[in-house]
Every structure is written in structure tokens, then in C-alpha cells.
């Protein structure tokens, strides 16, 4: 049977804090555990998820976690299912809310001597206790003229008088925490002797040298005073005007008129009303000078026929906000139809070729007017002027393939060779008109070429096959100087290609015929056994009917290939002694000898006093040092062949003789001693 070792239990939890409902199960076989909330399976989220068999809450939520949780363990094999005890959270929370007018129904109904009730919309569990404030000062329950009902969260003022005017706020606290009102209530109960606003001045935007009017009226018993001030607190009256407000007039009803407005008149104007009692009322309004900036440039636009496109006109910065309209051919666009204006956008629906042209965006306000043109091109699908033709191009010469098309805007042409895009390089060039030039035609250029001409409206393509007319040429050209080994068999190849397979023959440069032991077999000159007389100049001639003949001259040298008479041996030398590395080579022409030591050629002219290369090829190194150790290579070469042989040189410390060693004891390796 399935047994719960740990069962979930109901518990207090704090809104937004961690919590854990424990569940641990013991069963004969494997089981899977899941949780129910009010009978429905609980799905894991980042906030609430299974942790082993328990249910973990990263942040308790009073709405999503209210209800009954139950842990269910199921053995899927047997179908046995066990359910834990139910558990729920007692979630403690507090949530801020506004201060609202409960009585009377609207602010307009508040009169002196009426009862006013405000409600604090802070809620929570457990129910919090409330504290009221006016203008930040706490209101205690026992004070005159107001009562606080904590149960209804209400503050009642009876009767309400001007002295109750102010900003009302509330705070509440509970075991969970504290919260204060998210929005406060301003109670304003008029005193007849206090100045009250009848007409407030409004911000004004005017063009330079135009006139501006600000209206301002207050009421009170007895009537209040009214004064106008400009930014720098200078009073404006009909008797004393500041120098920069010479054209200002204050009317009996409180209105202020400014004529021929200039930039220096822009700024904040204050209208101040003062009743017999109470604070002065200061009303502000700003005079702005109208302005309009330049419009940004439009990029030319390319559209395709049949599509719908929009061009947005960004109005220039300006005051007041400039109005925007579009014109085409001097006519303002309508707000509906196929080509019309929508907001600041020019809309072209189902575009026709005839829609191409210049469209103008206008922007205007009190400060003036601005305009900007946009050039609209309606793209057309390219049409052929000249398609690429199947062509025969000569090898080694430039070749051209045409791809001439016309469209609006000018079409772009790309070429493909064997379905691969041709990128322009030293061999390929695409001219402005679309023609492809192959700078030096090669045999493998014989293939399919395709050109594609495109505009935003569409593309056309055509292909052509190129056949390369091969030039008559040696493949590869024979080496002009070649060596043959004396008394050995030798071959000298010569092959050529052309439009037609060429015939190939060899002859001696002096015109004499080839000896009988020398054969010419399909272009390969074969010497059965090379003699000294075979040396000389030979010519390979390749010819065919259409292309004539070509010649290649070869100078054959008969040589005795190099052999070493003496080779250097592995040598060990005491430090400070002299090393001799012998090397002698023979061959015809007589070989020259070079030495390579420590991976660099030893230049006889730059050897220094310690090293010397003898006429016979041997290398001597005096006063050897450990750094002279290494491999030394003797290289023998002549005009026909090169051969090398190498040996290591070891430089060792001279041993101190021990008494046990007789004077005749040989060293354990071959030594050169001097």
C-alpha cells in the first residue's frame, strides 16, 4: 500500500514570499506524485513547481494559491492511488488603494456645512488598522468635527468647513506590513472671501508680430484684486509697463492683450487673484512664438506595379504642431481612393505605371510652410534588346556575350556560368550595358552561360552555350634545356592540342635526319642508348590543316650523372680540435660541390677563418666548438643533375684520463685527433 510519511499541512503564508507544502511517500514500487488544487491538477510554473514530491512556492499569490491543495501518489502499474490530507494557506497581505469621496456623490455637491465622508481603499488580511492624515498631519480620532470608523475605513467630517480643506491621505498596517494610499484626495471647501477661479488663462501660440490675448477672472465677496506679472516678476499695468512690454493692455475684466508680439515677449505670464482672506491664487500661462523647422529629405522610392506602398512624411518640428498634406501635380490628394493620404502617409494602392512622378509633402503652421519632394519610380519588368547567343570564342583572345535589356529603373544584370554566379575578377568583367567580357578565353570556358536582368518588378533570363576554338599549342610546352644520361635509354615527350588533333614530329635543328637508334613515336623522341653524338638542338613540329604549324626548340645535353667517389662519414671530434668532412663527386659536366651545415648553405666567401672548403670538395673546421655539432650535407650539382649526401658531426669534451686506463685504450667511437 502507498503510505504518506509526510503530509501537507495548512499554514500561514505571506503574499509574495516563499512557501513549501511537504509530501513524502513510501510505496512497494515506483509511484508518481502530483498535486491538486481544488480538485484540478497543478501545472508547474516558475512560481509554483514540484520539488521532489513536495510543492514549492517561489512567491505565494493570494489569488492563484487560495483553495485546497492535495498531494496524490499513484502507482501506475497497479493503478493504486493514495491522497494526502487537504492543506490550504492563510495568506497574509496588504494592498494599497486610493482615498475616494464616499459622500456626497460628487465633488460638485460639496458645500460648506455639509457632511463629507472619505473612504480609504487599502485592503488586506488580516484586516489592517487605519490612520488618516490631512496635509501630512495625522488626524486623531477624538478631535472635533471628524470621526474615524476603522471598520468601514471611513473618515467623516461634520459639518465640513473651509478649515477642513487640504490633502487627505491614509495609511494602514497589519501583521503583514504597512501601505499608504496610492492616490490622495484634495478637499476644497470655499470661503466666500477667498478668491476663486472663474476663468483661467490658457497657453497661447502666436506668429511673430501678431497679437495675443490671455483671459483671467476671479470671484470673491468682496471682489478680489487681480494682477498680471511677466517672467521676471515685473507687474504689468496700463500705467507702468516694463520696457519690453510696451504694447500690453490690461482690460477691466482682467484680460491681457499683447500686440505685435516679438521673441522677447515669449515666456510665462502669471495672473494673481487675492481675496479679502485666504492665500493668493496664482495662475500661469505661457506665450509661445510659432516656429517651424525644415523637413528632412526623402530618398527616391522605387515601387512595383500592382503593389500597395506607403510613404511616411515626418512633419518638421514646429509650434503649433504643423499640419501635413500631400500634393501631386499641384493637386492635394484626397483622403480616400486609390492614391490617397492617410494621416501623414501617402498611400498608393494597386500601383500603376502612370503613378510615377514627383509627390510633395507640405507642412504648415502659424510660422509658415515647408515642403519636400519625393520622386517615385514605378519599376517595370525588363525586356530584351539583345539576348546572349550561342558563340564560338577563340582561345587566348577576349570573348563577349551580350545581355542587353531595358526597364525602369535601369536593370541590374548578373551572369552565371554553370549555375555559379560570376564574380568580377581579372578574367571576367560585366559592362554597364550587361555585356560579359571574358578577358582571355581558356579551354574550360566552353560551357553554359546565363544572364539575369532584374528590377524590383521582376527579372528575365536567357542562356547561351560557348564553344572555345582552341589555338594550336604545345601541352605542355617542352622544356627548352633537357639532359640525357650517357649510355642510358631516354625519352623526350612532345604533345600538342588544337581545333583538330595535330600531327607531331621531331627533327634535328640542322635539318639532318634522326639516327636509326632514335625513334619518333607519336611525338615522343626515344633514344635506345644515348651517345655523345645525340647532344644538340632538336625541333618538335605540331601541325594541322586549319591552323598550320608551331615549333618548339629543345637543346639536349648528354651528361654523365653525378656519383660520389668519397662520401662524408659520421665523425666525432674533441672540442678545440679540427674536423675533416671529406666529399668528392664525379660526373660530366664536372660537378661543383657545396656544403650545407645546420640547415643553411655554407658560402665559401663568407666562411670565416675556422672553416675552409678544399678544391676537391672536402670541408675542414678548425677549433671545433659544441655549436658546430649537427648534420652536414655535401651537395654536388651540374647543369644536368644534383645529388647530396650527409653525415653527422659530434663535438665532445676531451676526457680526463684515469689511472686504470692504459695509454693504448681506444676511444669508444671513431675519432679524428689532431
Amino acid at each position: 500500500a502507498i503510505v504518506f510519511i509526510k503530509q501537507p499541512s495548512s499554514q500561514d503564508a505571506l503574499q509574495g514570499r516563499r512557501a513549501l507544502l511537504r509530501c513524502e511517500v513510501e510505496a512497494p514500487g515506483p509511484v508518481h506524485v502530483y498535486w491538486l488544487l481544488d480538485g484540478a491538477p497543478v501545472q508547474d510554473t516558475e512560481r509554483r513547481f514540484a520539488q521532489g514530491s513536495s510543492l514549492s512556492f517561489a512567491a505565494v499569490d493570494r489569488l492563484q494559491d487560495s483553495g485546497t491543495f492535495q498531494c496524490v501518489a499513484r502507482d501506475d502499474v497497479t493503478g493504486e492511488e493514495a491522497r494526502s490530507a487537504n492543506a490550504s494557506f492563510n495568506i497574509k497581505w496588504i494592498e494599497a488603494g486610493p482615498v475616494v469621496l464616499k459622500h456626497p456623490a460628487s465633488e460638485a455637491e460639496i458645500q460648506p456645512q455639509t457632511q463629507v465622508t472619505l473612504r480609504c481603499h487599502i485592503d488586506g488580511h488580516p484586516r489592517p488598522t487605519y490612520q488618516w492624515f490631512r496635509d501630512g498631519t495625522p488626524l486623531s480620532d477624538g478631535q472635533s468635527n471628524h470621526t474615524v470608523s476603522s471598520k468601514e475605513r471611513n473618515l467623516t467630517l461634520r459639518p465640513a468647513g473651509p478649515e477642513h480643506s487640504g490633502l487627505y491621505s491614509c495609511c494602514a498596517h497589519s501583521a503583514f506590513g504597512q501601505a499608504c494610499s496610492s492616490q490622495n484626495f484634495t478637499l476644497s471647501i470655499a470661503d466666500e472671501s477667498f478668491a476663486r477661479v472663474v476663468l483661467a488663462p490658457q497657453d497661447v501660440v502666436v506668429a511673430r508680430y501678431e497679437e495675443a490675448m490671455f483671459h483671467c477672472q476671479f470671484s470673491a465677496q468682496p471682489p478680489p484684486s487681480l494682477q498680471w506679472l511677466f517672467e521676471d516678476e515685473t507687474p504689468i499695468t496700463n500705467r507702468s509697463r516694463p520696457p519690453h512690454l510696451r504694447r500690453a493692455t490690461v482690460f477691466a475684466n482682467g484680460s491681457l492683450l499683447l500686440t505685435q508680439v516679438r521673441p522677447r515677449n515669449a515666456g510665462i505670464y502669471r495672473c494673481i487673484g487675492q481675496g479679502q482672506r485666504g492665500p493668493p491664487i496664482i495662475l500661469e500661462a505661457t506665450l509661445h512664438l510659432a516656429e517651424i523647422e525644415d523637413m528632412p529629405l526623402f530618398e527616391p522610392r522605387v515601387f512595383t506595379a500592382g503593389s500597395e506602398e506607403r510613404v511616411t512624411c515626418l512633419p518638421p518640428k514646429g509650434l503649433p504642431e504643423p499640419s501635413v498634406w500631400w500634393e501631386h501635380a499641384g493637386v492635394r490628394l484626397p483622403t480616400h481612393g486609390r492614391v490617397y493620404q492617410k494621416g501623414h502617409e501617402l498611400v498608393l494602392a494597386n500601383i500603376a505605371e502612370s503613378d510615377a512622378g514627383v509627390y510633395t509633402c507640405h507642412a504648415a503652421n502659424l510660422a509658415g510652410q515647408r515642403r519636400q519632394d519625393v520622386n517615385i519610380t514605378v519599376a517595370t519588368v525588363p525586356s530584351w534588346l539583345k539576348k546572349p547567343q550561342d558563340s564560338q570564342l577563340e582561345e587566348g583572345k577576349p570573348g563577349y556575350l551580350d545581355c542587353l535589356t531595358q526597364a525602369t529603373p535601369k536593370p541590374t544584370v548578373v551572369w552565371y556560368r554553370n549555375q555559379m554566379l560570376i564574380s568580377e575578377d581579372s578574367r571576367f568583367e560585366v559592362f554597364k550595358n550587361g555585356t560579359l567580357r571574358i578577358n582571355s578565353v581558356e579551354v574550360y570556358d566552353g560551357t553554359w552561360y546565363r544572364c539575369m536582368s532584374s528590377t524590383p518588378a521582376g527579372s528575365i533570363e536567357a542562356q547561351a552555350r560557348v564553344q572555345v576554338l582552341e589555338k594550336l599549342k604545345f601541352t605542355p610546352p617542352p622544356q627548352p634545356q633537357q639532359c640525357m644520361e650517357f649510355d642510358k635509354e631516354a625519352t623526350v615527350p612532345c604533345s600538342a592540342t588544337g581545333r583538330e588533333k595535330p600531327t607531331i614530329k621531331w627533327e634535328r635543328a640542322d635539318g639532318s635526319s634522326l639516327p636509326e637508334w632514335v625513334t619518333d613515336n607519336a611525338g615522343t623522341l626515344h633514344f635506345a642508348r644515348v651517345t655523345r653524338d645525340d647532344a644538340g638542338n632538336y625541333t618538335c613540329i605540331a601541325s594541322n590543316g586549319p591552323q598550320g604549324q608551331i615549333r618548339a626548340h629543345v637543346q639536349l645535353t648528354v651528361a654523365v650523372f653525378i656519383t660520389f667517389k668519397v662520401e662524408p662519414e659520421r665523425t666525432t671530434v674533441y672540442q678545440g680540435h679540427t674536423a675533416l668532412l671529406q666529399c668528392e663527386a664525379q660526373g660530366d659536366p664536372k660537378p661543383l660541390i657545396q656544403w650545407k651545415g645546420k640547415d643553411r648553405i655554407l658560402d665559401p666567401t663568407k666562411l670565416g677563418p675556422r672553416m675552409h672548403i678544399f678544391q676537391n670538395g672536402s670541408l675542414v673546421i678548425h677549433d671545433v666548438a659544441p655549436e658546430d655539432s649537427g648534420r652536414y650535407t655535401c651537395i654536388a650539382g651540374n647543369s644536368c643533375n644534383i645529388k647530396h649526401t650527409e653525415a653527422p658531426l659530434y663535438v665532445v669534451d676531451k676526457p680526463v684520463p684515469e689511472e686504470s686506463e692504459g695509454p693504448g685504450s681506444p676511444p669508444p667511437y671513431k675519432m679524428i685527433q689532431t
Epitope: H32, P41, T78, E80, E81
Partner: antibody, heavy 112, light 110 residues
């Protein structure tokens, strides 16, 4: 001996209703989950729904609305009520306790 | 809607062969391991082979094994025996007490 026996299958006309029973012996339904699974002739297994140990039911999306699983713990029997039957509901209907214990199945044929 | 896809749908093999059947689910199974494999022979109720992805059911030979996690699972028969030619089904369990079967793999003699 622990076993399950299905009954109530038979021929029914399209649009008709049928109630299948699955009687359990050797164990009490109130501690176990019971599945209904069906298999159309020559086709694969298709899960219909489940009733858990508390009597809550869950269904395959295609079965919701037409099929209802219930139980009577006093009779130790699980039921499958099938309404608005169609030709494609023709199948052998199995009841199963968990994954291991299956009944022999009962054939339902929907045909006019 | 949950879809479980078994592959291959049919499989021909010989006695002694190693056979692998895969089961892919359109969403992860519960706890990444709530998956079972059944064997069914014609006219019989399905027989449980593997439960919780890799556990061998009572009386099932050890040549059967299961593996996988999340949404991809495999059933392996290490050395096919004559009695193993049958149809095999995978079954997954999902959040919200929802279950689903694969379409089945029919294993026949080559």
C-alpha cells in the same frame, strides 16, 4: 482473484447510445484509478479516459462531450456511457486498472 | 492534442536479431519518465513490458529494456526470440491525468 470483466457491448445504430460496464473483483475501486481503452478492428490502441480514486474523470480530447466515465463503488463497477455513436466508434473496449491489469474487452459495433 | 509517433510502423527481423523501436511524443511526458511499453498478440489484451521508461514488469524477460527521457524513448530487444513476434505500443502519461498511445509497431519474421 483480482480481475476485470467488461460487459454491455453489442450492435448499435449510428446516433444511438450504449453503456459499458467493467466489474472489478478482488479489490475496491475507491483506492484505484481505472482506464478505458479501445481498439478498432486491425488498428492500434486508443486511450479513452480515466476515473481516479476520488471519482474525478479525465478524457482524451476526441472523447469529451460524447463519452462519460462513472462508477458505483457499492457495486464495484466502472461505467462508460457512449452517446451519439458513429461507425468509427466500432471497436473492442477494454477497461484497465493501472497499466498491468486489463479486462478481456467487449466488442461494440456501430452500424445501420 | 498530444501525438505519439512510433517508428518504424512495421519491422521484419530474424530470431537472434537486436531490435530497437523508438517512440517520440509531441510534448514531454510527466516527470520526464511516465512512459510504458506493451506487447499485444492478436485477439489478446495488451501485456505490460516496461513502466516508468526503464523498469521491467514482473515476469518479463531481461532481453527487453527501455530508455529515454522527456519526449524521446526507445524499446530494445537484445536477442529476438520466436515468442517476441507481436505488435508493440508505447503509452505516455501527461500533466492533467491525460494518457496517449503510439500507433504501434508490428514486428514480423523476416
Amino acid at each position: 482473484e483480482v480481475q476485470l470483466v467488461e460487459s454491455g457491448g453489442g450492435l448499435v445504430q449510428p446516433g444511438g447510445s450504449l453503456r459499458l460496464s467493467c466489474t472489478a473483483s478482488g479489490f475496491s475501486l475507491s483506492n484505484y484509478v481505472m482506464n478505458w481503452v479501445r481498439q478498432a478492428p486491425g488498428k492500434g490502441l486508443e486511450w479513452v479516459g480515466i476515473i481516479d480514486s476520488s471519482g474525478s474523470t479525465y478524457y482524451a480530447s476526441w472523447a469529451k462531450g460524447r463519452f462519460t466515465i462513472s462508477r458505483d463503488t457499492s457495486k464495484n463497477t466502472v461505467y462508460l456511457q457512449m452517446n451519439s455513436l458513429r461507425a468509427e466508434d466500432t471497436a473492442v473496449y477494454f477497461c484497465a486498472r493501472g497499466l498491468y491489469l486489463w479486462g478481456q474487452g467487449t466488442l461494440v459495433t456501430v452500424s445501420s | 492534442e498530444i501525438v505519439m509517433t512510433q517508428s518504424p510502423s512495421t519491422l521484419s527481423a530474424s530470431v537472434g536479431d537486436r531490435v530497437i523501436i523508438t517512440c517520440q511524443s509531441s510534448q514531454s511526458v510527466y516527470n520526464n519518465n511516465l512512459l510504458a511499453w506493451y506487447q499485444q498478440k492478436p485477439g489478446k489484451a495488451p501485456k505490460l513490458l516496461i513502466y516508468y521508461t526503464s523498469n521491467l514488469a514482473s515476469g518479463v524477460p531481461s532481453r527487453f529494456s527501455g530508455s529515454g527521457s522527456g519526449a524521446e524513448f526507445t524499446l530494445t530487444i537484445s536477442s529476438l526470440q520466436p515468442d517476441d513476434f507481436a505488435t508493440y505500443y508505447c503509452q505516455g502519461g501527461y500533466h492533467g491525468n491525460i494518457y496517449a498511445f503510439g500507433q504501434g509497431t508490428k514486428l514480423t519474421v523476416l
